[in-house]
């Protein structure tokens, strides 16, 4: 049967507290994904920036995740209104704000 | 890394207005709650103002309430604070700051001037 969005959500949030808590070295290497500047469509538009970086094991269950939340297809490379043109940040940092806007949307029972 | 860059401070005399905006880089801004706090010269630090993740709700401090208004364009990842009718007491550094309640999360700029005198 499907999961219900709440308990999805919640299980994202857990995976990404797992990769913030359990982080010893650089995350993915310290790869760079864009920035996006747009509140709309958080779950693609955090895919769209995520699913360019490759080799991560720590964030493919992530990734993952994501594509469930996200309704259209999403590849590597694609262009989207909501990343911030030549604004790139570093992984780590990205999980981290991701986590906790998710923690918010979840208190505010956004939960797709 | 990430970094709140406060401008806009200055002189103004009392009555005068200015906008203090906050440009942010180095994290995802539109999904934070942020705000604005001050400190005046000798003074604490004062909550001023803030606005939600997606600007649809504000608080402000009773001190600056119908005077000031916060807002913010997600697109540029900037903060505003807008004063009008500034007074002598309005004088402090204001800070750009995150807002959220979780640990870890707290970022602040440096910092702009803002003197209010005749």
């Known amino acids: 049967s499907p999961v219900p969005p709440s308990t999805a959500l919640k299980e994202l949030i857990e995976e990404l507290v797992n990769i913030t808590q359990n982080q010893k070295a650089p995350l993915c290497n310290g790869s760079m994904v864009w920035s996006i500047n747009l509140t709309a469509g958080v779950y693609c538009a955090a895919l769209e920036s995520l699913i360019n970086v490759s080799g991560c094991s720590a964030i493919e269950k992530t990734q993952r995740m994501l594509n469930g939340f996200c309704p259209h297809k999403v590849s590597a490379g694609q262009f989207s209104s909501l990343r911030v043109r030549d604004t790139k940040i570093e992984v780590a940092q990205f999980v981290k704000d991701l986590l906790v806007h998710l923690k918010k949307l979840f208190r505010e029972g956004q939960f797709n | 890394g990430v970094q709140l860059l406060e401008s806009g401070g200055g002189l103004v005399q009392p009555g005068g207005s200015l906008r203090l905006s906050c440009a942010a880089s180095g994290f995802v801004f539109p999904w934070y709650d942020m705000g604005w706090v001050r400190q005046a010269p000798g003074k604490g630090l004062e909550w001023v103002s803030s606005i939600d993740w997606k600007g649809g709700k504000t608080y402000y401090a009773d001190s600056v309430k119908g005077r000031f208004t916060i807002s913010r364009d997600n697109s540029k990842n900037t903060l505003y604070l807008q004063m009008n009718s500034l007074r002598a007491e309005d004088t402090a550094v204001y800070y750009c700051?995150?807002?959220?309640?979780?640990?870890?999360?707290?970022?602040w700029g440096q910092g702009t001037l803002v003197t209010v005198s005749s």
């Open positions: 700051a995150t807002a959220e309640d979780e640990p870890g999360y707290d970022y």
